[in-house]
Interface confidence: low
């Protein structure tokens, strides 16, 4: 069957990009740093605005190898701080509780279902 636009708008594509580029501060050359910075800013904005975490959820950052994991110790940041529930100053409500995965202090919903919903309706 013919590929549709929706076929390309898949969680795997987003996941691959996020894992490779999010907070990747050590590319072999800096051409890709330009792109990595853009991806990082986009994901930070998405996670903060939509109160979501990763593509499928916080487990993305634990299940898969990622640039984020290379740059951050698992104990310090099991997932990006943007996955934490924020106060009105855009600071984590309780960073330690967020890191420990205490319900109510981190977002357990993935961003893909939030952004794919509107796309699927067109």
């Amino acid at each position: 069957t013919a590929a549709t636009q929706q076929d390309f708008f898949t969680p795997n594509l987003f996941l691959k990009q996020m894992l490779e580029r999010y907070q990747n501060n050590s590319p072999p050359n800096n051409d890709d740093q330009w792109k990595n910075n853009g991806v990082t800013k986009t994901w930070d904005r998405l996670m903060l605005q939509d109160n979501c975490c990763g593509v499928n959820g916080p487990s993305d950052w634990q299940k898969y190898t990622s640039a984020f994991r290379t740059e951050n110790n698992d104990a310090d940041y099991p997932w990006p701080r943007q996955c934490c529930v924020m106060n009105n100053l855009k600071e984590p409500l309780n960073l330690e509780a967020c890191k420990l995965g205490v319900p109510g202090f981190y977002h357990n919903q993935g961003c893909y279902e939030l952004i794919s919903g509107p796309m699927n309706r067109h």
Epitope: S26, P28, N29, D32, W34
Partner: antibody, heavy 122, light 113 residues
Framework: QVQLQQSGPQLVRPGASVKISCKAS????????MHWMKQRPGQGLEWIGM????????GLNQIFRDKATLTVDKYSSTAYMQLSSPTSEDSAVYYC???????????????WGQGTLVTVSA | DIVMTQSPSSLTVTAGEKVTMSCKSS????????????LTWYQQKPGQTPKLLIY???TRESGVPDRFTGSGSGTDFTLTISSVQAEDLAVYYC?????????FGGGTKLEIK
């Protein structure tokens, strides 16, 4: 082997736009950013900007933001740079260049085109 | 933007002599993530295109004679030619490969007596 073949010298009238081409061969065109440099006669090198042939994302030196437009044609493996409203200040040799053997391999520009001399004169 | 300053702007030496030229950047070029200094050296002979000599401050490009050595870290870098040959007559440029825009130094012109 990797080759970057640039278009021939151009004599242009002030104000008339000019487009330079850089045809790549010997590697997969979409795997490496293409960069453009300027060198005025007897002067040093200036980095103009870069373009990712896979998705046409560009990173431009702000100095050249209103002067240079970078594009690619993936199907002919050719990168283009258009200079708008040229003045005598734009008279220079322009080079296209890319990094080492693989897109994630080396720092520095290992491969250069032979250069295109642009002369702006009434 | 990172400003790259090279010195001297020109120097004249006798074949066989040791030569050092300096390159200073206005900001550190050290990537703390991988501990590499994103500083590149190029050689441009008269009428030719620039040629990559050294990347990551000290890694010699394939085919470059071992008389060329790059050193330094952070903001201060040096290119050394241990025994200058007649064919080394050229302008040498350093380049910030750390952040966009990837600025070049003004160059050091090497002349042979």
């Amino acid at each position: 082997q990797v080759q970057l073949q640039q278009s021939g010298p151009q004599l242009v009238r002030p104000g008339a736009s000019v487009k330079i081409s850089c045809k790549a061969s010997g590697y997969s065109f979409t795997t490496s950013w293409m960069h453009w440099m300027k060198q005025r006669p007897g002067q040093g090198l200036e980095w103009i900007g870069m373009i990712d042939p896979s998705d046409s994302e560009t990173g431009l030196n702000q100095i050249f933001r209103d002067k240079a437009t970078l594009t690619v044609d993936k199907y002919s493996s050719t990168a283009y740079m258009q200079l708008s409203s040229p003045t005598s200040e734009d008279s220079a040799v322009y080079y296209c260049a890319r990094r080492g053997r693989f897109s994630y391999d080396y720092g520095g520009f290992a491969y250069w085109g032979q250069g295109t001399l642009v002369t702006v004169s009434a | 933007d990172i400003v790259m300053t090279q010195s001297p702007s020109s120097l004249t030496v006798t074949a066989g002599e040791k030569v050092t030229m300096s390159c200073k950047s206005s900001q550190s070029l050290l990537n703390s993530g991988n501990q590499k200094n994103y500083l590149t050296w190029y050689q441009q002979k008269p009428g030719q295109t620039p040629k990559l000599l050294i990347y990551w401050a000290s890694t010699r490009e394939s085919g470059v004679p071992d008389r060329f050595t790059g050193s330094g870290s952070g903001t201060d870098f040096t290119l050394t030619i241990s025994s200058v040959q007649a064919e080394d007559l050229a302008v040498y440029y350093c380049q910030n490969d750390y952040s966009n825009p990837f600025t070049f130094g003004g160059g050091t012109k090497l002349e042979i007596k």
